[in-house]
């Protein structure tokens, strides 16, 4: 977790002057109650905004807005802290709001937003906004809390950001898979513009079932620079086991930007059809 | 290929305790918190709470607060959540996922009966 | 906690039907909200998350949209493989919360 740039972030609006800080997402007021505090926050909103750095890359952010309630305690409020955790990694961030100013009610309701926080692809954040000073122990609550998903570099405006692209997000290998004769399978794909070997991972299953009955791994090392864009043909061998007929095939690139975590993609053949009547079995057995 | 295969299937008397393990493959196993969901016999699914891969940091729905236990084994990739003071009502099949907030991939399912 | 109220309770379609399922949140969850697609016996399987998008693997026959309260999740045209209970779940507040499902069985 990370903020976008280091400038100079701005929290300031007419009739409000503010500063935006670094936290360590424990405020004093946890340490040195105070008898008065706020209310929560109202109207949290999380979405997913994209921006760019002074360089230029593009990155998704957690674009947070939020509201104040229309009662007294805002007479009482002194800034907000804004915490980010990933959800898995239990890391947190944290900017405090600092109000340099006294707020006075105004004709319409105060709002907030802060765009800085860089989010990766494909991860699960809970965020949270606090009015400061926090409340005493015991006493109510003035956060508002919610969960914010991040898509995948699958997503379409996702796909071009720099974190993506950086994973191979713009590759299209456009796989192929064709059953042969004589249990074997032909794979094609369109190979990326870089010389980096690949890696096909053949795993098959049985018609209804999750559990692997093969597995096989296949090197394919760099292409030259005249064969970039163009397609590999490659004809994997399969176990000739019955009913092991469902493969999945996955090409992992070995791009230099991402090496052994790029985005793979896969294709899957599915086990061919049943016939709706089983053929009958010849009560004899032809000699020939 | 992203796998999660759980435990057997599991008969327990009223006030007993039970552990459903969870192992995972085919993924980094850090990446991804796990989360558990219950179904009753032909009812919906019911969240029960997930558990940080990365720390062990867990979070539990309310109801299941004091009862449930959702620890994790890096060295195995093996998710376990235990249920104690089991009661007739908590018969159900009890699934693993993957992840904390959208579910993307299942285990199979552990049938859990109570009954004297 | 948010209810999730989905609707019909249950629908008789046929192959190649264009089937339309709803959900509505109790309050509002922006767009933080999957579909799930489970078959008797088996586990549920995730169709589309945050509302919209289509998880990876999954049939482009399948859509959600929504924001706020109301969901929907459609599928263009009826696959017999689609016959199952459908499920949506909210997850921008804790704790997460499902829909009590919808059969879609065939006409």
């Known amino acids: 977790l990370r903020l976008l740039d280091h400038r100079a972030l701005v929290c300031s609006q007419p009739g409000l002057n503010c500063t935006v800080k670094n936290s360590t997402c424990l405020d004093d007021s946890w340490i040195h109650p105070r008898n008065l505090t706020p209310s929560s926050p109202k109207d949290l909103q999380i979405q997913l905004h994209f921006a760019h750095t002074q360089q230029g890359d593009l990155f998704p952010v957690a674009h947070i807005e939020w509201t104040l309630q229309t009662d007294a305690s805002i007479l009482y409020l002194e800034g907000a802290e804004l915490s980010v955790l990933q959800l898995n990694t239990n890391e947190r961030l944290c900017v405090r709001f600092e109000f340099l100013s006294k707020l006075r009610h105004h004709h319409r309701r105060w709002r907030f937003t802060f765009s800085h926080f860089v989010v990766d692809p494909d991860q699960e954040y809970e965020v949270t906004v606090h009015h400061l000073p926090k409340p005493i122990p015991d006493g109510d609550p003035n956060h508002q809390s919610k969960n914010f998903l991040v898509p995948d570099c699958e997503h379409a405006r996702m796909k071009v950001t720099t974190p993506c692209m950086s994973s191979g997000s713009l590759w299209d290998p456009n796989i192929t898979v064709e059953t042969l004769e004589a249990h074997q399978l032909r794979v094609s794909f369109t190979l990326w513009n870089e010389s980096t070997h690949y890696q096909i991972l053949l795993t098959s299953f049985p018609h209804m079932e999750n559990h692997s009955c093969f597995e096989h791994m296949h090197h394919i090392p760099a292409p030259r620079p005249e064969e970039f864009h163009q397609r590999s043909n490659v004809t994997l061998t399969l176990r000739n086991l019955k009913g092991c007929c469902r493969h999945q095939v996955q090409i992992q690139p070995f791009f230099s930007s991402c090496l052994n975590d790029c985005l793979r993609h896969s294709a899957t053949v599915s086990c061919p059809e049943m016939p709706d009547t089983p053929e009958p079995i010849p009560d004899y057995m032809p000699l020939w | 290929q992203v796998q999660l295969v759980q435990s057997g299937a599991e008969v327990k008397k009223p006030g007993a305790s039970v552990k459903v393990s969870c192992k995972a493959s085919?993924?980094?196993?850090?990446?991804?918190?796990i989360s558990w969901v219950r179904q009753a016999p032909g009812q919906g699914l019911e969240w029960m709470g997930w558990?940080?891969?990365?720390?062990?940091?867990?979070n539990y729905a309310k109801k299941f607060k004091g009862r449930v236990t959702m620890t994790t084994d890096t060295s195995t990739s093996t998710a376990y959540m235990e249920l104690r003071s089991l009661r007739s009502d908590d018969t159900a099949v009890y699934y693993c996922?993957?992840?904390?907030?959208?579910?993307?991939?299942w285990g199979q399912g552990t049938l859990v009966t109570v009954s004297s | 906690d948010i209810q999730m109220t989905q609707s019909p309770s249950s629908l008789s379609a046929s192959v190649g039907d264009r089937v339309t399922i709803t959900c509505r949140a109790s309050?509002?969850?922006?767009?933080?909200l999957n579909w799930y697609q489970q078959k008797p016996g088996k586990a549920p399987k995730l169709l589309i998350y945050?509302?919209?998008n289509l998880q990876s693997g999954v049939p482009s026959r399948f859509s959600g949209s929504g924001s706020g309260t109301d969901f929907t999740l459609t599928i263009s045209s009826l696959q017999p493989e689609d016959f199952a209970t459908y499920y949506c779940?909210?997850?921008?507040?804790?704790?997460?919360?499902f829909g009590q499902g919808i059969k879609v069985e065939i006409k």
């Open positions: 779940q909210q997850f921008e507040h804790n704790p997460l919360t």
């Open positions: 085919g993924y980094a196993w850090t990446r991804y918190g």
């Open positions: 558990i940080s891969t990365y720390s062990g940091n867990t």
């Open positions: 309050q509002s969850v922006h767009t933080g």
């Open positions: 945050g509302a919209s």
């Open positions: 996922a993957r992840r904390v907030l959208r579910l993307d991939y």
